[in-house]
Structures are given as structure tokens and as C-alpha cells.
Amino acid sequence: TIPPHVQKSVNNDMIVTDNNGAVKFPQLCKFCDVRFSTCDNQKSCMSNCSITSICEKPQEVCVAVWRKNDENITLETVCHDPKLPYHDFILEDAASPKCIMKEKKKPGETFFMCSCSSDECNDNIIFSEEYNTSNPDLLLVIFQ
């Protein structure tokens, strides 16, 4: 995905649908790319990203990536197509309405990633284990 404020040319009129055959509309996501963050050892954090964008492609979802190494903590917020890997990982939770962080194995750093399918859902990133698949909110498969 091309970040906001970078102009692009888009001309494609195929109809995009979700797994149930419903027409998939684009959504609103936080889109600040990589920014330094103070989010650490918290159950949840706000992105503190002031840029919201309508994803260019209807199939794209909101993504957040939290990384911590010896030097700093960063938070990345973007739109991304869940059919394509991001940072070499599949977006397995793309249908969730909430951005529930899951740890991924990356050498030399702590790496968490989440994806979600409700407007601006990557503004609030959740690390707490109390949000698991027993949470009824996560059973809502929504594409808004």
C-alpha cells in the first residue's frame, strides 16, 4: 500500500467481495507508517497517529505493527491487503473488529502485529490476554 500524501493513479472497476460474497467497501484506517512510540507494558494503547485515510483498495484492512529493540519502540499503522503477507506474516485476524496484538518471531526485537476490519480499528491496539476468541466482539465478522 502506498502511504498517504503520496499521489497515485488507480483505475480498476472489478467488484471486490468478502468470503461471504458481500460487496467489500473500503474502510477508514490510521495511516502514519512508522512512528516512535511510548506504548510499553500496557494492556492497550492509542496509536497517537493523527492521519486517518480511506484505504485505496476495498479489500484492504487496518494493520498495526509494534516493535521494540534495544534502542526504541515504534508503532506502524497502515492499510494492507490481507491476501498478501505483511512483514513476511499472514494477516490471520483481518476479520476481527478489534486490533488484538499477537507476537511474531523476529530476531533481535520484540515484534507484535494486528489487523482488523472496522473503521479506524488500528487506533486502539490491544495487548491484553483477556481479549481472546471467547470475546463475543471477536466473533463478529465485519467488513465495514
Epitope: 500524501h5 484505504c55 465495514q144
Partner: antibody, heavy 116, light 110 residues
Amino acid sequence: EVQLLESGGGLVQPGGSLRLSCAASGFTFSSYSMSWVRQAPGKGLEWVSWISYNGGSKYYADSVKGRFTISRDNSKNTLYLQMNSLRAEDTAVYYCARRIAAFDYWGQGTLVTVSS
Amino acid sequence: QSVLTQPPSASGTPGQRVTISCTGSSSNIGSNAVSWYQQLPGTAPKLLIYANSHRPSGVPDRFSGSKSGTSASLAISGLRSEDEADYYCGTWDSSLSGYVFGGGTKLTVL
């Protein structure tokens, strides 16, 4: 069939208040973000406000910030717009619409007239 | 003054192709997907194009949308009398943190 039905419009004096409602049916209301859009007589469309599916995030147009409040009751499948300190320039047909990235369904609108 | 600029009027004869432009900036059209809406006289607006160029089901393929840089356009081919309406472009503005519409274009079928 998706339906959005606005109500609560009417004649109000400048400085007065009004609460608009939008009753939604035909879809899982609690799964969708919702918006209010208005249209002054003979004028173009103006976005007013947006609320996320769970009410956790809200945005307002500068022209209504601090005066209007958007809210929702997912148990009643209803969207609200509380309008305070109304001005003559708030006179318009107010539409509720589904989503924000593309307003895919619209209500028929309710007319708000602010006049003394 | 609208954030997005559209021509106030456009016209064409039946069967013709008409294009309506929508010009913005890097903070709106340049970095966000664009939608187009049709408003027939006395009715609520209807979504015509979303995500720059996608048509909702039920919208004829005579309507097409495109976007390049900070401009978008709506093309209507094989113009019909029932296409006479107001057309609005719209998108999010990342600087204003709000949705913005063009001023609207009144299409007349001669």
C-alpha cells in the same frame, strides 16, 4: 432490505436544541460505522459527523464542533444527533448514512428549520 | 467554498459521453479513495462509485470512475435522460480529519 429512517426534525428558534434519530433495519447495525450528512436548501452536501461501530471514535465537521453530539444505541439499532445552540445556517435536510469511506445507504432525510 | 472543486454544470445529448472532474489536494484525493454520488431531483443521494472506480451492484456500467494524483473524474457514456441529476464527489481529508464533498455538478441532458 437495508432501511434508514430519520426523525426528529422540525422548526426551532436560533439558540434552541433538537435531537435527531435514525432507526436502522435490514442489517447488523452494531457492525457498521454511521454518519450524518446535511444539505441546506438548494445547496450541496455537507458531512456533519461520524461514529464508529461501537461508539468509541467520533468526528465532527468544524462547523458543528462543540455544538452537535453524535451517539448510538446498538441495542435499539438507532443513531442520534443532538444539536444544541442551533443557528440559521444549520437549516438543512439531515440524512443519516451508513459507513464513512463510501456512504452506501442513505435515509430519506429529515428537515431542520432554524428560524425566529 | 468546497474543499473539492467540481464544475457547477455539465451537459450532453442522449447517447453522448460526459465527464465530470473533481480536483482536490494531497491531503484528500491524493491520499484517499474517492466516491461519487448521484442525487436525482427531490431524492436522497445514491452511491454511484466507490474506491475510485468500483461500482456497487445495480449501477450500470455506463458509469465509470478514475483517479490520478489529486484529481478524480466520473464518466457517463451513452447518456440518458434519467441521468439528469446532481453529481457529487467525496473523500476523507486527512488534514481536516473529516469527510469532504465537492460542490456538486448539475448534469443536464439536452
